[in-house]
């Protein structure tokens, strides 16, 4: 009888094992082992037992011990099971960004590994098992479908193999694939909202705002704003699921014409874009031309208004005749025209919008001086010792300087409150002078002096005022 020990062995691939072949007869004619594996006999005393070292075991094998005894020939097999973990555990590549609501198929491929009966493939999200299946086929493939949710954002998906040799007295061998980090996103089907001026004037700045709601994760959204070839540099502010990108756009004469304004939002592997046209125009303010901005009274003045060739102008509310970019009016300058504003309003149609520009010029009319009875009365009669304010207003442009002197030396304080004394009486020569010339006017001041009359048996003094020309006394009058 031939026996073998051990009858069953589980060993790692490439490993070695000692196999003992024994026979029950004392003097066997023949005792040996049949195997394709490299073998080495270990020398032992006695004839009925032999020990072999089998090495480099790469696959399951069944070496057979045999013996030839007087009573006959017999054999015994040992079962060598080789174990090894898979050489490749891999999740099939997927785009890292996945839209929420999409069915995502996770596919795990496993190459190698034995014994397959003990090999299980597990698909996981984080530590949560999604699917567990025995490894079947070469390569073994396990798939599962996941409905992408918003809360999956940033989740790690992986595939794990479990070679469970615990029933055989060994351990559980695990191999894990490289994780796949899922980036979920929501990019709404609606294009971004773009708010910008439809028309923009050369050498000015405009503000462009691009916004979109319902984004996830909003912080990962990329916003590209451009006007023609000019990339804009927006300031982006974020809400919970929205953003607003605000940029300043400056345009020059080179940009004149119709330009394309684009706002593109890129999130994940998708994008939304809004296009808008902006018309860039040049429209200088109209020019108001006065023959001379400062003229003397009676001068003929031409006021011209000139604007952009395509503009239509009105001058002081009167449209050009015929309607067009030029208007003019003629006038003879009067004092009433001093400070008069001539306003030219020009209107230009740009991309269906009416643009208005104004320019105003003021006319200065030099006139005067004037001194008349209404503003500078020729006669004043005041009671002595009363408080009076001599008033004499000279008119003209420029405003004339006014002096009223008596005897070429004594001033009358115009516009000042004075106590009326006899000194004040007399005729004053008022002279108004400006760069436009001078005028004179005589002003007489009469002082009413009290005269006291005593009645015989009267009840007292009657104060009677009469206009009285006062003699000039040296002691009362004084040069400035």
């Amino acid at each position: 009888q031939t026996s073998v020990s051990p009858s069953k062995v589980i060993l790692p691939r490439g490993g070695s094992v000692l196999v003992t072949c024994s026979t029950s007869c004392d003097q066997p004619k023949l005792l040996g082992i049949e195997t394709p594996l490299p073998k080495k006999e270990l020398l032992l005393p006695g004839n009925n037992r032999k020990v072999y070292e089998l090495s480099n075991v790469q696959e399951d094998s069944q070496p057979m011990c045999y013996s030839n005894c007087p009573d006959g020939q017999s054999t015994a097999k040992t079962f060598l099971t080789v174990y090894w973990t898979p050489e490749r555990v891999e999740l099939a590549p997927l785009p890292s960004w996945q839209p929420v609501g999409k069915n995502l198929t996770l596919r795990c491929q496993v190459e190698g590994g034995a014994p397959r009966a003990n090999l299980t493939v597990v698909l996981l999200r984080g530590e949560k098992e999604l699917k567990r299946e025995p490894a079947v086929g070469e390569p073994a493939e396990v798939t599962t479908t996941v409905l992408v949710r918003r809360d999956h954002h940033g989740a790690n998906f992986s595939c794990r193999t479990e070679l469970d040799l615990r029933p055989q007295g060994l351990e559980l061998f695990e191999n894990t694939s490289a994780p796949y980090q899922l980036q979920t996103f929501v990019l709404p089907a609606t294009p971004p909202q773009l708010v910008s001026p439809r028309v923009l004037e050369v050498d000015t700045q405009g503000t462009v705002v691009c916004s979109l709601d319902g984004l996830f994760p909003v912080s990962e959204a990329q916003v590209h704003l451009a006007l023609g070839d000019q990339r804009l540099n927006p300031t982006v502010t974020y809400g919970n699921d929205s953003f607003s990108a605000k940029a300043s756009v400056s345009v020059t004469a080179e940009d004149e014409g119709t330009q394309r304004l684009t706002c593109a939002v890129i999130l994940g592997n998708q994008s939304q874009e809004t296009l808008q046209t902006v018309t860039i125009y040049s429209f200088p303010a109209p020019n108001v031309i006065l023959t001379k901005p400062e003229v003397s009274e009676g001068t003929e003045v031409t006021v011209k208004c000139e604007a952009h060739p395509r503009a239509k102008v009105t001058l002081n509310g009167v449209p050009a005749q015929p309607l067009g970019p030029r208007a003019q009016l003629l006038l003879k300058a009067t004092p009433e025209d001093n400070g008069r504003s001539f306003s030219c309003s020009a209107t230009l149609e740009v991309a269906g919008q009416l643009i208005h520009k104004n320019q105003t010029r003021e006319l200065r009319v030099l006139y005067g001086p004037r001194l008349d009875e209404r503003d500078c009365p020729g006669n004043w009669t005041w009671p002595e010792n009363s408080q009076q304010t001599p008033m004499c207003q000279a008119w003209g442009n420029p405003l004339p300087e006014l002096k009223c002197l008596k005897d070429g030396t004594f001033p009358l304080p115009i516009g000042e409150s004075v106590t009326v004394t006899r000194d004040l009486e007399g005729t004053y020569l008022c002279r108004a002078r400006s760069t436009q010339g001078e005028v004179t006017r005589k002003v007489t001041v009469n002082v009413l002096s009290p005269r006291y009359e005593g009645g015989s048996g009267g009840s007292g003094l009657n104060d009677i005022f009469e206009a009285q020309k006062i003699e000039w006394h040296e002691e009362n009058l004084y040069f400035q």
Partner: antibody
Framework: QSVEESGGGLVKPGGTLTLTCTVS????????MGWVRQAPGKGLEYIGI?????RTYYASWAKGRFTISKTSTTVDLKITSPTTEDTATYFC??????????????WGPGTLVTVSS | AYDMTQTPASVEVAVGGTVTIKCQAS??????LSWYQQKPGQRPKFLIY???KVASGVPSRFKGSGSGTEFTLTISAVQSDDAATYYC????????????FGGGTEVMVK
């Protein structure tokens, strides 16, 4: 327009001296003319004025000691019984009405009067 | 009586500095006040009239102010050429006046 004084020089105390101011470029019928003096190292001192109407006005201290008169082109200042205290440079000044400046804008160069025995 | 009191009698000021001269009338002369500058051996030069109006050709560094009885002449950014005696003169007709001029202020520039 100008004014110029003449007639200054050495005068004995108690004598009489008349200074003359000759004007050109304006009319005395429309301008008042005055006299101001300045003793050596001292301040300006107003003496008096003759108005455009020929009336005369004097500082309180000058009454009786000075007399101002005029012709069509000259203005005279007569100093009666001068004393050594009357030693000064005498300026003829035009009231500046025409130039709208209240002050003596037009001044003569001055004439020096020395009162000494 | 309309008497003029001028202060100070003399003042020293550095180049670039500011000097203020005051003139007080014994009663209101409204705005009828003039200021003069006189250098040794020269006739007075007219600076300001009507208390605050600057005569033609006078630098804007000279500024007059006041009305009634209190008046001021201010010279800012003083230059060495401003060294002189300055007089105020009341130009309002009145009686019993000893002198139309203030006593003068000598301005020395260091």
């Amino acid at each position: 327009q100008s004014v110029e004084e003449s007639g200054g020089g050495l005068v004995k105390p108690g004598g009489t001296l008349t200074l003359t101011c000759t004007v050109s470029g304006f009319s005395l019928s429309t301008h008042a003319m005055g006299w101001v003096r300045q003793a050596p190292g001292k301040g300006l001192e107003y003496i008096g004025i003759i108005g455009s109407s020929d009336r005369t006005y004097y500082a309180s201290w000058a009454k009786g000691r000075f007399t101002i008169s005029k012709t069509s082109t000259t203005v005279d200042l007569k100093i009666t019984s001068p004393t050594t205290e009357d030693t000064a440079t005498y300026f003829c000044v035009r009231d500046p009405y025409d130039s709208f400046d209240d002050g003596y804008r037009l001044w003569g160069p001055g004439t020096l009067v020395t009162v000494s025995s | 009586a309309y008497d003029m009191t001028q202060t100070p009698a003399s003042v020293e000021v550095a180049v670039g500095g500011t000097v203020t001269i005051k003139c007080q009338a014994s009663q209101s002369i409204y705005s009828y006040l003039s200021w003069y500058q006189q250098k040794p051996g020269q006739r007075p030069k007219f600076l300001i009239y009507d208390a605050s109006k600057v005569a033609s050709g006078v630098p804007s560094r000279f500024k007059g102010s006041g009305s009634g009885t209190e008046f001021t002449l201010t010279i800012s950014a003083v230059q060495s050429d401003d060294a002189a005696t300055y007089y105020c003169q009341q130009a309002y007709s009145s009686s019993n006046v000893d002198n139309a001029f203030g006593g003068g202020t000598e301005v020395m520039v260091k």
